[in-house]
Amino acid sequence: WELTILHTNDVHSRLEQTSEDSSKCVNASRCMGGVARLFTKVQQIRRAEPNVLLLDAGDQYQGTIWFTVYKGAEVAHFMNALRYDAMALGNHEFDNGVEGLIEPLLKEAKFPILSANIKAKGPLASQISGLYLPYKVLPVGDEVVGIVGYTSKETPFLSNPGTNLVFEDEITALQPEVDKLKTLNVNKIIALGHSGFETDKLIAQKVRGVDVVVGGHSNTFLYTGNPPSKEVPAGKYPFIVTSDDGRKVPVVQAYAFGKYLGYLKIEFDERGNVISSHGNPILLNSSIPEDPSIKADINKWRIKLDNYSTQELGKTIVYLDGSSQSCRFRECNMGNLICDAMINNNLRHADEMFWNHVSMCILNGGGIRSPIDERNNGTITWENLAAVLPFGGTFDLVQLKGSTLKKAFEHSVHRYGQSTGEFLQVGGIHVVYDLSRKPGDRVVKLDVLCTKCRVPSYDPLKMDEIYKVILPNFLANGGDGFQMIKDELLRHDSGDQDINVVSTYISKMKVIYPAVEGRIK
């Protein structure tokens, strides 16, 4: 019996087609992805093959103005239109709190939403009961397939799930649910979830009875043969893991942003064992036409976005200096504003020991593309912020050793004075450079804001200590020459859309007046 699994993950609000790098589509003939194009391909496969499941491994939420405005209603609507068969909860599904998941998505989805390792407690338990499930048995043709879900246990550090959801260890939580499916005579089981490729492989290895793992979170691109676009494969598709009980378990992921549709064919024997698996992600490029009905609907929904982008978010009573003449040479108040917003967006998980889990921000000055003039009645709009941060990136959370941070700050000024983009703006950091010294030895003082303290204060950076830092995904991926961050980071979790982070902060503060205050000397 043959099953076709179509899968997406980490779509992050890319409802419209995008450019090849998943930013805003400029030249339509070269654009990719989007739900209208995805629909065309999915329908084509459904017409051609009998047993097709369409699955999503989480993080539909967060990433473009679509999510900012529609807050998840757009996800439910277009996933319903595509007739998804199941979705696993990702960490970003909790970005607007549990209410922001329940109302627009859980209550409106016409498909099961899954996670076996999230347990509700207290008053939330009855409110959310039945709205998401640990697993679902789906009839497919004349057979049944069990889908069991999982979500990153780091979600409380990455999003806003509140205090009434407990995120258990994935493997510990999955095993009893898989065992339950086995007792229900379900012998074909897919683990669908959002914990990253390393955890996906562990699940394949450790959870007895899981036949296939469909993952997300790490934006992993797998491919067999010559890859069709810019993404470099992290391994073959499917990636085969030998389980502890000797089975060959295919593990798949489909990069991110709706650029590819994962396509996996699995052949099962009559006892539900995987005999063979093969496939590849399908690049959703312009050779696949956008479905006219979905496209027309996208255009209808778009109208509200255009109106939103010119509305006032808040006011500034000072000039927001985002000029390259400032931000690539010295501390600039636009850099301070953005870093303060980045930290504010990550205020979560305080306890008796820690006032917050992260206190530091770094931001390449070259990523700040425009100032905002306060003389326009002080008005700040989404449109203004899109000029400051035009690349559609995210502000991510990484863990780095102090020694890596020191290298990053040396890199920041290694060729100072040439108006290059790597000059770092900061938050929760005081850095002093001596530019008379030779490159690679210019950082003379580097103090960082404590987190394990009741009164935050600046202490000298310790080379062997592990620190959490918020930074643009561009830097986490080694951009602007920050190869040491990419090579030495100990953990990397994708965060929220850059413009959204700053706009939320401005809306919250209502009136802003960031200063140049001696963070960089």
């Epitope: 459904r46 047993n51 097709v52 068969d85 043709g141």
Partner: antibody
Framework: QVQLVQSGAEVKKPGASVKMSCKAS????????MHWVKQSHGKSLEWIGY????????TYNPKFEGRATLTVDTSASTAYMELRSLRSEDTAVYYC????????????WGQGTTVTVSS | DIVMTQSPSSLSASVGDRVTITCTAS???????LHWYQQKPGSSPKLWIY???NLASGVPGRFSGSGSGTDYTLTISSLQPEDFATYYC?????????FGAGTKLEIK
């Protein structure tokens, strides 16, 4: 043109089962979900559930779960509904209905199958 | 479940009258997923208005629909003989899909 043609009227005894059919034509059968709706005499409409013809995935109204079974034969572009353990209150007209995929309205209705349950 | 309450349950009116039928949802429904059907005796229901205000193909312009949140209306600006029928509202914003009990429009 797009149409749904349903099987003829049925008379059944309480406790029996009935299986009715709905033949689709004029469109690609797998592209649209097929719903089933009950209408008792002089009464309103009651949703039973729907099936995705491309993979036979089903969603039921909890009220009918376990007693109604929806299936398809894609090669014949035909949907079926079986209703088991019939009782007198199952006497009704049953419609198969195609739904729009964007806003889920019912744009094409079958002519209905009348089921009478009587001892 | 979202309960759809239609009022009135029946209505006697004359040709040329302006008629309004209301449908109230027990909790908020997106206007995109609120639809109306017309049914005449011995026939299957027909899609009449979809997504609150869009007339289905072949529906005369004297019909209109409006509303948001929990309150929706179907209006006939000038009643014609062929409009006497039963009208049902329907939501599939949230599962399970539900219908109103119907409004029967009769000749006075």
């Amino acid at each position: 043109q797009v149409q749904l043609v349903q099987s003829g009227a049925e008379v059944k005894k309480p406790g029996a089962s009935v299986k009715m059919s709905c033949k689709a034509s004029g469109y690609t059968f797998t592209d649209y979900n097929m719903h089933w709706v009950k209408q008792s005499h002089g009464k309103s409409l009651e949703w039973i559930g729907y099936i995705k013809p491309h993979n036979a995935g089903t969603t039921y109204n909890p009220k009918f779960e376990g007693r109604a079974t929806l299936t398809v034969d894609t090669s014949a572009s035909t949907a079926y509904m079986e209703l088991r353990s019939l009782r007198s209150e199952d006497t009704a007209v049953y419609y198969c209905v195609r739904s729009d995929f964007l806003y889920w309205y019912f744009d094409v209705w079958g002519q209905g199958t009348t089921v009478t349950v009587s001892s | 479940d979202i309960v759809m309450t239609q009022s009135p349950s029946s209505l006697s009116a004359s040709v040329g009258d302006r008629v309004t039928i209301t449908c109230t949802a027990s909790s908020s429904v997106s206007s995109s997923y609120l639809h109306w059907y017309q049914q005449k005796p011995g026939s299957s229901p027909k899609l009449w208005i979809y997504s609150t205000s869009n007339l289905a193909s072949g529906v005369p312009g004297r019909f209109s629909g409006s509303g948001s949140g929990t309150d929706y209306t179907l209006t006939i600006s000038s009643l014609q003989p062929e409009d006497f029928a039963t009208y049902y509202c329907h939501q599939y914003h949230r599962s399970p899909l539900t219908f109103g009990a119907g409004t029967k429009l009769e000749i006075k």
